[in-house]
């Protein structure tokens, strides 16, 4: 393993995560670790001199930056709250306030908005999709032989009770919004009117 600064033929350093090519001196030099920045650029004889980020600033990755990024508060106006404070090697960790969910742009949560809970009416249920973050619930009717009797964003349609399995008989048929009503069978020898 070569120790920076070292010369290289093809401008590709051995450890590209922790080293970078410095074209002015045609050498590979050390990057600064997270939480630090470049205080003095390397030369052919001396490696990079790093310094800890000043108070209220940070660098998250191995870098050859001449400054650190300014710490930012979590933005209440956009619906965020702080989970963990900013440190020299990590920006403040923010999340959506309760009852709010992320609006994403290029895989980044750019702001939060209140969750719009669509209530599926009796006789319907929320359509199952792969979109976990989808707040626009689509309500679909219960399949035949199933019912759902609440106004709910999450309730599922259940199969109608089968009276005969319980040794009972049907008193009233099930609908999409109510279960079958069962009753005891008539006593043997009782008159059927």
């Amino acid at each position: 393993q070569l120790v920076p600064p070292y010369r290289i033929e093809n401008q590709t350093c051995w450890d590209q995560d922790k080293e970078y090519y410095e074209p002015m001196h045609d050498v590979c030099c050390s990057r600064c670790p997270p939480g630090e920045f470049v205080f003095a650029v390397c030369s052919r004889s001396q490696d990079t001199v790093c310094k800890t980020c000043p108070h209220n600033s940070y660098n998250e990755h191995w870098n050859h930056l001449s400054t650190c990024q300014l710490c930012r508060p979590c933005d209440i106006v956009l619906g965020f709250e702080e989970v963990a404070p900013c440190t020299s090697d990590r920006k403040a960790e923010c999340r959506c306030q309760p009852g709010m969910s992320c609006v994403y742009l290029d895989n980044e949560c750019v702001h939060c908005e209140e969750e719009r809970l669509v209530l599926c009416q009796p006789g319907t249920e929320a359509e199952v999709t792969d979109e976990i973050m989808d707040t626009d619930v689509n309500c679909v009717p219960c399949k035949p032989g199933h019912f759902q009797n609440t106004s709910s964003p999450r309730a599922r349609c259940q199969p109608h009770t089968r009276c005969e399995i319980q040794g009972l008989v049907e008193a009233a048929p099930g609908t999409s919004y109510s279960d079958t009503i069962c009753k005891n069978p008539p006593e043997p020898g009782a008159m059927l009117l």
Epitope: N56, R72, P73, D75, I76, G79, E81, E82, Q97
Partner: antibody, heavy 120, light 106 residues
């Protein structure tokens, strides 16, 4: 200690503009959002909007969208609010207040306010 | 938009009284509430943040409580210097102030 300096009073004629300043000392405004709050004579406090001084991004309430323009200058650690098309009901005290890394969800520091009087 | 309603709008009380001010949100704000005191001709001063946490330097006679939509600021033993207007402020999904309660001395 965080301190915010605002000029005490500004006089503006109807239809013109005024630019209010809020100079912060003891804290880098790059680590804050700067908020502006209005208080009309004898009335309550109303949030106008805020600026992110690092990139100039602003968010304002609908009623101030075409009234207030928020800017900031990192080099002088100062935030500004320009009020345009002044009308008599813009007569009010305007406060600036930062949310900071240690107080991200409350206004622990306030400027003393600038009284804007609109009169011909 | 979430509305913040304070009551009463005005209140007169005597030195030593226990005083309770109310702030009601139009929907759940999850305890994301601050209280400010403003005296005539001055900027507001933060008293309590996050419903019940006393800001540094504020006397312990001030306390806050509440949850959901209903919040309270209590002054356990009123002092002459407490004559002021008190504002609640929600910080759930942005900032909104209540209309204020003006507290006067009898």
């Amino acid at each position: 200690e965080v301190q915010l300096q605002q000029y005490g009073a500004e006089l503006g004629k109807p239809g013109t503009s005024v630019k209010l300043s809020c100079k912060v000392s003891g804290y880098n405004i790059g680590n804050t959002y700067i908020h502006w709050v209005i208080q009309r004579p004898g009335k309550g406090l109303e949030w106008i909007g805020r600026i992110d001084p690092t990139n100039g991004n602003t968010i304002s309430t609908e009623k101030f969208k075409n009234k207030a323009t928020l800017t900031a200058d990192l080099s002088s650690n100062t935030a500004y609010m320009q009020l345009s098309q002044l009308k008599s009901d813009d007569t009010a005290i305007y406060f600036c207040a930062p949310t900071t890394l240690t107080t991200p969800d409350s206004f622990a520091y306030w400027g003393q306010g600038t009284l804007v009087t609109v009169s011909s | 938009d979430i509305q913040m309603t304070q009551s009463p709008s005005q209140l007169s009380a005597s030195v030593g009284d226990r005083v309770t001010l109310s702030c009601k949100a139009s929907q759940n704000i999850y305890k994301y509430l601050n209280w400010y005191q403003q005296k005539l001709g001055e900027a507001p001063r933060l008293l309590i943040y996050s419903t019940n946490i006393l800001q540094t330097g504020i006397p312990s006679r001030f306390s806050g409580s509440g949850s959901g939509t209903d919040y309270t600021l209590t002054i356990s033993s009123l002092q002459p210097e407490d004559a002021a207007t008190y504002f609640c402020q929600k910080y759930y999904s942005g900032f909104t102030f209540g209309s204020g309660t003006k507290l006067e001395m009898k």
